[in-house]
């Protein structure tokens, strides 16, 4: 910060509650689409323009004037691999957190014109170009569809679909949400000629019945309904197919082909995880029991003679874990190398730690590439020469991220391709590769400025700066900004990192009031290396809240030990830690503790009512918006993960026991403002209303709001600005502020 | 490079039952259809009937009683066999690719007589 | 069946001169038609799938439109390797039916 140390003599403006509901300082980012292994395309004014990677000169793709008599507002375009389609978004309809229904058309890049005939319909639900050339997969009403070309008419692939019921190639609510984290089940083969596709089958799965407010003028409230599999309650069945776009025709119908799962899978209730194609006629399938500690990796081979596809139960690659569950959510992808007779992937080692492991898929046993007390992050790209991953070995921080890459011809020759290039600013990298890894961009977020650089593989260097932010640096100068401070406590020898937003001119001689952020599911990571602006920066900055996270038991990215602490204990030793990290930094001398809150959004806000229902003592109030209240009213495949099932043979004990309800008594000595959405689609306006009851029927004052036609992200324009008003007000009345 | 090379054609007598073979490389029996047509001297084309990838087959109603079309994958072999053949099925035989609606592929034609 | 009806049954033109040939449906087919060239002793070959797209090899000056029940292929400028007899084909509906065919030749 430039001005004085003293924050009396300092007379500039600070961080405003309206400067992060206005977004007064914007990030700025460098959103590129790599269109070849040296091309990408990036919107700028609204032209599309296209790049050269090596040199850095660029052309016009696609004038802003081009849709100017288009008549409809474009949500989003896609342009096909050979470059001569563009597809357009309109009329986009959110449903979930990802899916969404659209309205599409496609213009011809060559002659300059919208294709009139054959169009996609509208409330199209997914659709997606093949890897190469100009095919289009869609999904409309539930069932898959192929244009060859895009002005030819469709071939119709499915004829099951049923709203609510029978969904072909798209996800069903949990599949979305918990599996996938997408509305596509579609997968391309890589030269386009196959399409693999989900079915999934709710026909038996209990529906979540909720209303929808709407317009003022609407009379009688809509009710919403949404097959949810809550935790021990009928799933969703899934099968799976895939159809040779080559053989479509008018006249007869596509012929599908099964992939049945595992006989190890079928004995059950089961899970699709994971669809990866190896090579153009070999698909790897990943299938999870219901108990997510076994999973069975299928590598299945086209028959040419038969039309069939052949899964040997040789190549079958078995994943289980004897201490929690497969896979940090789900088990991990495989990344094939170009002759699709091995993979490499992520996977727990000996010792807890997740790291790359190099397969052959006639072998059973696997070779660690890597190894150590950090964790690969994801594996980003794969040539004939190199591996490259993100870890956050560097420095020994959990809450950083690096990019290495590794020879595959000698592991032990490992290079780290960001640690060094600007190591007080960039902590925290991504990365996109071109098309074949010739190039790649690095996306630096923390604990500085963002910052977006290009880089060449062939030697690693630096080509050049594509957004520095200096713009927006220039613009804090003038700001009293807060600083981040990331550091570890040791409790019972382990080492547990937390971070800390501190006021502008700190002093550590001064009490300080604290806020302590928290969301402390299963792998989470609060404490990083990320530089965000939000409202933690408006309440350090304006309110002199020091506003602190911690990455207690149950955390990610730091081993087994750690994240499968909780395995079978969610609402334990997470919300035990985040009470005896409040503690450890009252003992650090700068916190008043007479006023430290807590707050949460979501399994945040369950932690935090377990933690103000725990009768600790140490906190004074807190804020829980959308919490879970009960595992019983969550979604299956995320509770039953780590829970297992809720049955007296299982764990129906815990169950019962780790609800906020049960702990009601104890909020008569916080403060307690309860926040939900009507419309929560994903954590249900129920597990709110069960609190309240809970609490009103032990005699508990607190406070409460709801946000009409809400979800889970509370993110319309209006609820946002309202909902961290609300919150504000009621933080500063906690901590008795001005 | 696709290909298809008929064979089988010939002088029969009525009464007789003809078998061409239509050899397919290039491609699979089991992604694409292969369909039959035939040319009677001097006239338009006429079609016969196809075998789908999948193994089913659609006949025209005319030849639906006398027409088998069948194939061996292994033998990346389509073959036409008509019964009872009577003079009018003298005609330039076809077998074609079916690529989506449309034949992309003929094979070169294999000429058949039917004549006592 | 859906029955193809092809005129002219013959046609000739000089070279560099535009032809046309229609095909009507007997019902609508939307744009289900295909046109094949078929030159003397030889096999057919694919020009045009459905209805306007021209098959990858052959000479742009081929061009075809229409749809519903009313079809028209084109050679803008007639060349002499383009004598041969011309069908067009509905892939909408089985039985598969052929037009009669359209014979043309060079003045």
């Known amino acids: 910060n430039k001005g004085t140390d003293d924050a009396t003599a300092d007379s500039r403006k600070t961080y405003t509650l309206t400067d992060y509901l206005k977004n007064t300082y914007r990030l700025k980012l460098y959103s590129l689409r790599w269109i070849s292994d040296h091309e990408y395309l990036y919107k700028q004014e609204n032209n599309i323009l296209v790049f050269n990677a090596e040199y850095g000169n660029s052309s016009v793709f696609l004038e802003n004037s081009t849709f100017d008599e288009f008549g409809h507002s474009i949500n989003d375009y896609s342009i096909s691999p050979d470059g001569q389609f563009i597809l357009l978004e309109y009329n986009y309809v959110k449903q979930w957190r990802h899916s969404y229904t659209a309205s599409y058309d496609i213009y011809d890049l060559n002659k300059r014109q919208l294709i009139t005939e054959e169009r996609i319909p509208n409330n199209t639900q997914w659709v997606t170009w093949s890897p190469v050339g100009h095919k289009l997969a869609y999904v409309w009403n539930n069932d898959i569809y192929v244009k060859i070309e895009p002005n030819l008419p469709s071939y119709r692939i499915t004829w099951t679909g049923k709203e609510d019921i029978i969904y072909n190639g798209i996800t069903d609510w949990v599949y979305e949400e918990e599996v996938f984290s997408a509305y596509s089940a579609l997968w391309w083969s890589p030269n386009g000629t196959f399409l693999a596709y989900a079915q999934f089958n709710d026909t038996e799965v209990p529906l979540i019945e909720y209303s929808f407010y709407s317009d003022e003028s609407l009379q009688y409230p809509k009710t919403v309904r949404v097959p949810y599999p809550k935790a021990g309650a009928v799933n969703p069945t899934v099968k799976f197919f895939v159809v040779n776009t080559d053989s479509l025709s008018s006249v007869t119908n596509a012929t599908s082909i099964q992939i049945t799962a595992p006989a190890s899978m079928l004995i059950g209730d089961h899970y699709l995880c994971d669809v990866t194609w190896a090579t153009q006629e070999r698909i790897s399938l990943q299938w999870l029991r219901r108990i997510q500690n076994y999973s069975v990796m299928d590598i299945c081979d086209y028959d040419e003679s038969s039309g069939r596809w052949n899964c040997l139960v040789a190549r079958q690659h078995i994943e289980m874990s004897t201490t929690g569950w497969v896979g940090r959510f789900r088990p991990s992808e495989p990344h094939f190398t170009l002759d699709g007779n091995s993979f490499y992937k992520i996977i727990s080692n000996e010792e807890g730690y997740r790291h790359i492991c190099y397969f052959q898929i006639d072998k059973k046993d696997c070779t660690f590439i890597t190894k150590g007390t950090w964790e690969v992050i994801g594996i980003e790209a794969l040539t004939s020469d190199y591996l490259y991953y993100i870890s956050n070995e560097y420095k020994g921080m959990p809450g950083g991220r690096n990019l290495y890459k590794i020879q595959l011809s000698d592991y032990t020759k490992v290079t780290c391709l960001s640690c060094e290039l600007n190591p007080e600013r960039c902590q925290y990298y991504s990365v996109s590769f071109s098309k074949e890894a010739k190039y790649y961009q690095l996306r630096c977020s923390g604990p500085g400025l963002p910052l977006y650089t290009l880089h060449s593989s062939v030697n690693d260097k630096g080509l050049r700066v594509l957004e520095d932010n200096s713009a927006l640096d220039k613009m804090l100068q003038n700001v009293q900004m807060p600083s981040k401070k990331l550091d570890f406590i040791i409790l019972n020898e382990t080492k547990f990192w937390y971070q800390m937003i501190l006021p502008p001119h700190f002093d550590k001689s001064k009490k300080y009031p604290l806020l302590l952020d928290v969301y402390a599911g299963p792998c989470s990571q609060k404490a990083d290396t990320v530089f965000r602006l939000n409202w933690a920066t408006y309440l350090a900055s304006t309110e002199n809240i020091i506003v602190a996270s911690f990455d207690g038991r149950g955390s990610g990215y730091q081993g087994d030990k750690i994240m499968h602490a909780i395995n079978r204990r969610l609402g334990t030793f997470e919300v035990e830690d985040q009470i005896e990290a409040a503690r450890q930094f009252s003992k650090m001398g700068f916190v008043d503790n007479k006023r430290i809150a807590i707050w949460g959004w979501s399994y945040g806000g369950y932690v935090t009512s377990m933690v103000l229902g725990s009768g600790s003592g140490v906190f004074k109030c807190g804020i829980a918006v959308a919490p879970v209240s009960r595992w019983e009213y969550y979604d299956s495949v995320y509770t039953e993960r780590y829970m297992g099932l809720p049955t007296p043979e299982d764990n129906l004990d815990h169950y019962r026991n780790s609800t906020v309800m049960s702990r009601a008594e104890n909020f008569k000595q916080v403060e307690y403002l309860l926040i939900h959405g009507t419309a929560d689609d994903n954590v249900h306006f129920q597990q709110s209303a069960q609190i309240s009851k809970a609490l009103v029927d032990v005699g508990v004052d607190f406070q409460a709001m709801w946000y009409t036609d809400e979800d889970h992200g509370i993110a319309s324009s209006t609820a946002h600005q309202h909902i961290y008003t609300h919150m504000s007000h009621f933080i500063k009345q906690c901590f008795s502020l001005p | 490079e696709v290909q298809l090379v008929q064979s089988g054609g010939g002088v029969k007598q009525p009464g007789e039952t003809l078998r061409l073979t239509c050899t397919a490389s290039g491609f699979s029996l089991t992604t694409y259809g292969v369909h039959w047509v035939r040319q009677a001297p001097g006239k338009g084309l006429e079609w016969v009937g196809v075998i789908w990838g999948d193994g089913r087959t659609d006949y025209d109603a005319a030849f639906m009683s006398r027409v088998t079309i069948s194939k061996d994958t292994s033998k990346s072999t389509a073959y036409l066999q008509m019964n009872s053949l009577r003079a009018e099925d003298t005609a330039v035989y076809y077998c074609m690719r079916n690529r989506h609606d449309w034949f992309d592929y003929w094979g070169q034609g294999t000429t058949v007589t039917v004549s006592s | 069946d859906i029955l193809l009806t092809q005129s002219p049954s013959s046609l000739s033109a000089t070279p560099g001169e535009r032809a046309t040939i229609t095909c009507r449906a007997s019902?609508?087919?939307?744009?289900?038609l295909n046109w094949y060239q078929q030159k003397p002793g030889q096999a057919p070959r694919l020009l045009i799938y459905y209805s306007s797209n021209l098959q990858s090899g052959v000479p742009s000056r081929f061009s075809g439109s229409g749809s519903g029940t009313d079809f028209t292929l084109t050679i803008s400028r007639l060349q002499p390797e383009d004598v041969a007899a011309y069908y067009c084909q509905q892939s909408i509906k089985l039985p598969f039916t052929f037009g009669s065919g359209t014979k043309v030749e060079i003045k």
């Open positions: 019902q609508g087919i939307r744009n289900n």
